[in-house]
């Protein structure tokens, strides 16, 4: 067309993909008349009538735009719906009358593309690649136009570098006509970079202005050799038996060498290898004295078959022994003495500590216990505590019986138990004494003894009431190698009318229990003797 | 130191009796017990029968109940087996031995052998 | 009576060797934690020795090699590294109560 290079610039309408363009017709009224206009859609040089106007009214020509065309504004604008990326292209207006004059317009259409997505090479990167290695890919699906890609190192933008690092971006065109763009992030890393974050931004634009959007951050597998491997061992501090204790080997490469854990024999003074869980650690479960030695770890690298020895480490898990108590079942006549010692090994200070057993009273501070001018009260069970101070639940204990000679002594000397005749008794009577005594009855009846303890026995009578019974009573007579001792139940009969017994006697209708620990004018007291036992 | 020493053994006539002595000293000898036990040649050992030399009680085995009597002199501290009505199967070893309450036996003499023969 | 069976009646071995000797009763010879067993070891010609008391309780004067163990029935006398003088007969004895008995013997030699 003669003249077209001093033609103006076109109107720019632009407009995001799927909305409606208005082309408005910019021709003047001096320039030709609005109410007959030819519109044309020009791509690649060659005109396109899409839609005639005449007398006002609108009419499309078949083809792409045969649907999507109408006449606005009383006929001065065409609006196209539904545009497409292929849209992008100059529309002109074309008046008749007077002359011929047209007005361009250049449509640009636009679509921001989708969220970037980002991929990290899972393979991961060895920092000593000869030439830059692919990080990560970025894609950016169903823009338009192109967006363009910056890459990001620690919220730093990455530029190419020749050898060091190189960006490779391609784009497809899907059949919508919007683009998808795949950018390749390929670089030499440095150990430092393990941490790294990497992210892509897409920037675009859009008819409201420049726009981008961020994909999330991530971080890619680098690989590199190991320098040093070293123990590590929970909990930190000290250890003592019973604890659960973890030992790990860790390594400052990527990936981990192959660990293990070894163990210095003591005897040999050869390593000794460990048996560690899948994890590579090793657990003391309980931990105990043995375990405590000189640990190191060897990682292997099975690649290159280098192995690296860590700095050997010492644990120590603290214990405190069995306590043994000498003489361990000590047997001592009456005003005599007794020394009472307690020892116990241990990897620390040891503290001792003597406790009456009964009633938890200390005695004594030290692990001598000296006790003098005995008296038969001063049986029973001693207690020596062996603890570590400094670490707090470490002790072990050990209960000593001490038994005093002498002969039995009753745990009640007299007792009242209310019966009703032809009722079956159950009777019971407890004496102790050292050597332990046994325990026999003045009436028949079906008796049984149990021991209580080393010093301690408890006789149970099943006895029927009889009037002759209601007369004597009942006698328990406890007797040892040193003596013998008696105790005496008085049988009064119950009183169904008038009954409000007092709280020192049993009472029963078909079966009555004088039990030693109801006491019932008694000129002795009881106790107990506690069994012997070490426990830590 | 706390001794036993067992004195009377040696070759006697069946039917015939004997009284053994088991002499203590270097403890108080009424605050222990004294038992005696056998053991015949080759064979294990059996407990005969134990006296507190404090009360004069007595224990015995049933086995040898009316056969063996225990008696002490306290003056003398010294602690009898007397055995009546012998015969070959009373050959044996005799000690005396001194417990405690719990009757584990920490000292024992050093034993008189008992032959039954004619 | 309570019968006491020991296992085995001799075993062969070695100085150095870790031995062990069990006893059962017929019944219980346990009270509340006391438990009234006792080993002793006998020599030929000699009167027996006290090893152990109340099961485990080692009397004084005793090496340390010699521990004793268990409750109620079964009991272990335990001699951790032999050495020449522990080749001898050794006797459990109960006095959970009357009459007391012994077991009929490990006799240890030397393999």
């Known amino acids: 067309v003669p003249g077209e290079a001093e033609q103006p610039a076109p109107e720019l309408v632009e407009v995001e993909v799927g909305s409606t363009a208005l082309l408005k017709c910019g021709l003047s009224q001096s320039q030709g008349n609005l109410s007959h206009v030819d519109w044309f859609s020009v791509h690649k040089e060659k005109r396109t009538l899409i839609f005639r106007v005449r007398q006002g009214q609108g009419q499309s020509e078949p083809g792409e735009y045969e649907q999507r065309l109408s006449l606005q504004d009383r006929g001065a604008t065409l609006a196209l719906t539904q545009v497409t990326p292929q849209d992008e292209r100059i529309f002109l207006c074309q008046g008749k009358r007077p002359r011929s004059q047209e007005y361009r317009i250049q449509l640009r259409v636009y679509k921001a593309p989708e969220e970037p997505n980002i991929q990290v090479n899972p393979l991961g990167i060895p920092v000593n690649s000869k030439e830059p290695e692919e990080v990560a890919t970025c894609v950016g699906r169903n823009g338009y136009p192109i967006p363009q890609v910056i890459w990001y190192k620690n919220g730093r933008p990455l530029k190419e570098e020749k050898n060091r690092v190189h960006i490779q971006s391609s784009q497809t065109v899907e059949s919508s006509g919007l683009y998808t763009l795949q950018s390749i992030l390929k670089a030499q890393l440095v150990k430092e970079d393990k941490d790294a974050q990497f992210y892509c931004e897409l920037n675009y634009r859009l008819p409201s202005g420049n726009h981008m959007k961020e994909s999330r951050e991530v971080t890619v597998p680098v690989f590199y050799p190991t320098e040093k491997v070293w123990l590590e061992v929970e909990p930190v501090g000290m250890l003592k038996e019973g604890d659960r204790v973890e030992i790990r080997c860790l390594a400052d490469g990527n990936p981990p060498p192959h660990f293990s854990i070894s163990k210095q024999n003591p005897s040999t003074r050869e390593a000794e290898e460990e048996t560690t869980n899948d994890n590579g650690v090793l657990v003391l479960e309980p931990a105990r004295k043995e375990h405590s030695g000189r640990y190191e770890c060897q990682g292997l690298d099975l690649d290159t078959m280098i192995s690296l020895l860590s700095e050997p480490q010492e644990l120590l898990v603290n214990y405190v022994s069995d306590v043994r108590v000498s003489p361990a079942a000590p047997e001592r006549q009456e005003g005599s003495s007794l020394t009472l010692t307690c020892e116990a090994e241990s990897s620390q200070d040891l503290e001792f500590q003597w406790l009456r057993e009964e009633t938890g009273q200390v005695l004594e501070r030290g692990p001598v216990l000296q006790l003098h001018d005995l008296k038969r009260e001063a049986g029973g069970g001693y207690r020596c505590v062996a603890s570590v101070p400094s670490i707090p639940g470490l002790n072990r204990t050990q209960l000593v019986n001490v038994a005093i000679f002498g002969p039995p002594w009753m745990a009640f000397k007299e007792r009242k138990v209310w019966v009703k005749e032809n009722m079956v008794l159950n009777l019971s009577c407890e004496a102790s004494g050292h050597p332990r005594p046994t325990i026999s009855w003045n009436v028949n009846g079906t008796a049984s003894e149990q021991d209580q303890d080393p010093q301690r026995v408890l006789s149970t009578l099943n006895v029927l009431v009889t009037p002759e019974l209601l007369e004597t009573g009942v006698e328990c007579t406890a007797s040892n190698d040193l003596g013998k001792n008696t105790s005496i139940l008085f049988l009064e009969l119950v009183n169904l009318t008038t009954l409000t017994p007092d709280s020192n006697t049993t009472t029963g209708l078909s079966t009555s229990t004088a039990s030693p620990h109801t006491r019932a004018n008694s000129t002795s007291t009881e106790r107990k003797l506690p069994e012997p036992e070490s426990r830590g | 130191q706390v001794q036993l020493v067992e004195s009377g053994g040696g070759v006697v006539q069946p039917g015939r009796s004997l009284r053994l002595s088991c002499a203590t000293s270097g403890y108080i000898f009424t605050n222990y017990w004294i038992h005696w036990v056998k053991q015949a040649p080759g064979k294990g050992l059996e407990w005969i029968a134990r006296?507190?030399?404090?009360?004069?009680?007595?224990y015995y085995n049933e086995k040898f109940k009316g056969k063996f009597t225990l008696s002490v002199d306290k003056s003398k501290n010294t602690a009898y087996l007397q055995m009546n009505s012998l015969r070959a199967e009373d050959t044996a070893v005799y000690y005396c031995?001194?417990?405690?309450?719990?009757?584990?036996?920490?000292?024992w003499g050093a034993g008189t052998m008992v032959t039954v023969s004619s | 009576d309570i019968q006491m069976t020991q296992s085995p009646s001799s075993l062969s071995a070695s100085v150095g060797d870790r031995v062990t000797i069990t006893c059962r009763a017929s019944?219980?010879?346990?009270?509340?934690?006391?438990?009234?067993m006792h080993w002793y070891q006998q020599k030929p010609g000699k009167a027996p020795k006290l090893l152990i008391y109340?099961?485990?309780n080692l009397e004084s004067g005793v090496p340390s090699r010699f521990s004793g163990s268990g409750s109620g029935t079964d009991f272990t006398l335990t001699i951790s590294s032999l050495q020449p003088e522990d080749f001898a007969t050794y006797y459990c004895?109960?006095?959970?109560?009357?009459?007391?008995?012994f077991g009929q013997g490990t006799k240890l030699e030397i393999k």
């Open positions: 004895q109960h006095s959970r109560e009357l009459p007391y008995t």
């Open positions: 019944k219980s010879v346990s009270i509340s934690g006391y438990s009234y």
């Open positions: 109340l099961a485990s």
């Open positions: 006296i507190y030399p404090g009360t004069d009680i007595t």
């Open positions: 031995a001194r417990s405690g309450g719990y009757w584990y036996f920490d000292v």
